[in-house]
Structure formats: C-alpha cells, structure tokens
Amino acid sequence: MAVTACQGLGFVVSLIGIAGIIAATCMDQWSTQDLYNNPVTAVFNYQGLWRSCVRESSGFTECRGYFTLLGLPAMLQAVRALMIVGIVLGAIGLLVSIFALKCIRIGSMEDSAKANMTLTSGIMFIVSGLCAIAGVSVFANMLVTNFWMSTANMYTGMGGMVQTVQTRYTFGAALFVGWVAGGLTLIGGVMMCIACRGLAPEETNYKAVSYHASGHSVAYKPGGFKASTGFGSNTKNKKIYDGGARTEDEVQSYPSKHDYV
C-alpha cells in the first residue's frame, strides 16, 4: 500500500512540478523593472524568455517577441535550452510513469517492468527538475550581475546637465515559479525512485531443493524456514493491490495572459 501511495504521490507532485516548469517557461515576468530607489515612472517594464513587455499606467500593454536568434545573449539561449530540455524530459517521464503506476493495469505487465519504468521516470523527473532549477538560477545570476553593473552607473550624465535613467531589472515571478516547480519535480522524481525499490519483485535466495532422507519420501523446502527466521531483507509476503476504484482527474490550469498589443 505504501509503495502505491509513494508512487502515486510522486506522480502527482511531478505533474504539478512539470506544469509549473511549463508555466514558468511561458511567463513574461522573468525579470521586472526594479521600482526601489528609482524615479517613479508611468511605465513598467518586464521581460520573459521569449518576449519583453511594457505596461503603461494607462493600462496599455505592449509585448514584443525576440525575433532574432543569433542576436540574443548566449546565457538567455542556454536558459531557454535548459527549460525546454526540462519540459521534454518531464513530459516523457510523465508518459512513462502513467504506465508504471501500480494502480493501472496494462495487459499482463510484470512488476519488474513497472519497477524499471518507475525508476526511469523518476530519473527523468530528477533531471527535469535539475534542468529547471539550473535554468532559473543561471537567469537569476545574470540578473544579479546586470543589476549591480547598472547600479554602479545608475545615472549616465551628459555634461552633468541631462540625465538618462537606466532601467534596472530584478527577479520576476517566473523565477520563483520555476524554482518551486523544479523542486517539486525533483521531489516527485525522488519519490518515484523510492517507490521503485518497493515495486521490485522479491528474488528468492534459495531454490527449492528436494532432500531424500533414507526410508522417507519427504521434501523439505528451506524457503519456509528462511521466511520464519526473518532472514534477508526482501522476504516479506507482498499483498497484491487491485488499485480499487480510485481514479483522480488531474485538471491542470495554466495562467492565461492577455496582452493588448
């Protein structure tokens, strides 16, 4: 029962995590204009992996896609790649883990196959989570570097008469969504790996051997003795759970963005 619960919970946690990684990747608020210690402007800037947006106080929002590929910073390209790899691995992991779920019966799939699939999906989730965390962290590091660079020359003067205010950017909501989502996917993956250990079918250490004592025709099966003495770690009798009628519909909603271009 504990194995099924661990596997099911791992799947659900990973599902939420991957949905979060997808949401974070699509979000426009990876970096937002720093409002602290800045002149109050009637314009608010924020940027994502795919486009940058400007929201005027009047309510008008304009978003422009990064239509160049070669002109973008290498770091941004790297972050994009990490997030996409994370999503792809996570999606494959989800697909694999659905078939690996103990509560789902597919033909005459053996427990050993389900255990392998659970381990595979678990590893995929772990790598997916790490990719997301790495991607978000690289972007955050890029922001911190740029923030302090722009703080150093906050105002660039023209002969001391006219001042140009540099827009500083700080952490956007997508970074926090990405970190949490990556963490959840990682945790879900670990849970799947733990569940895999419990799913692996027990292997009997001793083959059943017939001993013929003189004058008697009795067969002794040492396996029985072994079980009673508590030898070995995988010797407990395992119950087979039929999964019951417990079906959960996972409805995942994504944040909708309304951009008035």
Partner: antibody, heavy 117, light 113 residues
Framework: QVQLKESGPGLVAPSQTLSITCTVS????????VQWVRQPPGKGLEWLGV???????NYNSALLSRLSISKDTSKSQVFLKMNSLKTDDTAMYYC???????????WGQGTLVTVSA | DIVMTQSPSSLTVTAGEKVTMNCKSS????????????LAWYRQKPGQPPKLLIY???TRGSGVPDRFTGSGSGTDFALTISSVQAEDLAVYYC?????????FGAGTKLDLK
C-alpha cells in the same frame, strides 16, 4: 462617443475645499484612467494628478498635501478634492482621459473655479 | 520634477509656411523596454480645451492631419507643421508622460502674420 464633463462650484472662498466631479461617458473607468489638469487665466497648463483604471493615484508633488482624487466606477464619476484654497488656485480645471503613452487623448470642456472672498 | 523647456515662446508665421517648435526635457523620456519616447504634444486654440496631436513623440492622435509631425528622442523633441493653416493659430504644449508628475512645458504660441 467619448465625453467628459466637469461640474464645479464656480466660486469658492479662500481656505475652503474645492470639489469637482468629472462625469464620463463612452468608456469605462475600469479600463481607462482620468487625469486632472488646470490652467490659470492667461497661463499655461499644470498637471494636477491622475487616477488610473486600477484605482492607483499619482499627484503633482507641489499639491500632494492638499489634493485627493477618487472615483465611483459604477456612476462613471471621478472626483477631485483640493483643500486650503488660495487665490492663486483660480483656474480652469479640466479632466481628461488617459490614453496611449499615458497622454490625455480626450478632454472635458473644463470648469472655471474662482477663489475669492 | 522633470522640467520641460519649450522654445521659442512665440512664433509668427505666414499661412502655408513650414514651422518647427522645440521641447527639451531635463531627463531622457526614452523607455529602454520598448524604445519609445514618452512625450506628447497638444494644441490649444483660444477658449478651447487642449487637443492631443502627438503621443509617443511621433505617433499622431486620431483625426490629426498629417501636416503635424513629431520627432526627436531622449531629451530633445520637435513638432513640425509642414504647411501652417489659419486654424493652427494656437498655443502648443509638450508633456512628459514618463516620469511623475507628468509635467507640461510652458507652451509655444503660434501667431499668423
């Protein structure tokens, strides 16, 4: 079509409070902000403040302590209140809709407020 | 506060002539996020409320004739009327739409000979 109409008291005594209402039609206050601008006789335009669609307000720093802008979205009305009036507050007061680029794309005809004893 | 300086304070021109007036801000009105300049131009005819001519420094407002052209970036802006008409007799104001408070310039008065 878009219309804005200011209604004010006309004459106000010094040290009293000025209340002007801007009634709008042709657009919703949930989607657009309203800015207030005044113009003393024979002088230039002076920006007073704004209330944006979300309800957030910004004021002219020189009038910050005396000015307050609010709105009643359901009645399509925006209110300007200015206390401790002085004679140099005598001006034509305009309300205008906040449009693209935070500019004032539609203006009311204005209401003349005279501060005099 | 941002100071908007308009020049000249008054202009006298003949109908059909091309005219240019200037506006200078004490800080750059260029937003790096969308590369737009947050400056507007208004025309105020005697006894009337102001009318929006240009926003984003160079975009004409609705119903504004194409003889009006806004230009400039950062701190220096200009409004050009390619062929002045009698109805253009007015005071022209520029406005900072980027920094609060959204200050106006003192205006340029356009007179006809």
């Amino acid at each position: 079509q878009v219309q804005l109409k200011e209604s004010g008291p006309g004459l106000v005594a010094p040290s009293q409070t000025l209340s002007i209402t801007c009634t709008v039609s042709g657009f919703s206050l949930t989607n657009y902000g309203v800015q207030w601008v005044r113009q003393p006789p024979g002088k230039g335009l002076e920006w007073l403040g704004v209330i944006w669609a979300g309800g957030n307000t910004n004021y002219n720093s020189a009038l910050l302590s005396r000015l307050s802008i609010s709105k009643d979205t359901s009645k399509s009305q925006v209110f300007l209140k200015m206390n401790s009036l002085k004679t140099d507050d005598t001006a034509m007061y305009y309300c205008a809709r906040g449009g693209y680029g935070n500019s004032c794309d539609y203006w009311g005809q204005g209401t003349l407020v005279t501060v005099s004893a | 506060d941002i100071v908007m300086t308009q020049s000249p304070s008054s202009l006298t021109v003949t109908a059909g002539e091309k005219v240019t007036m200037n506006c200078k801000s004490s800080q750059s009105l260029l937003n790096s996020g969308n590369q737009k300049n947050y400056l507007a131009w208004y025309r105020q005819k005697p006894g009337q409320p102001p009318k929006l001519l240009i926003y984003w420094a160079s975009t004409r407002g609705s119903g504004v004739p194409d003889r009006f052209t806004g230009s400039g970036s950062g701190t220096d802006f200009a409004l050009t009327i390619s062929s002045v008409q009698a109805e253009d007799l007015a005071v022209y104001y520029c406005q900072n739409d980027y920094f609060y408070p959204l200050t106006f310039g003192a205006g340029t008065k356009l007179d006809l000979k």
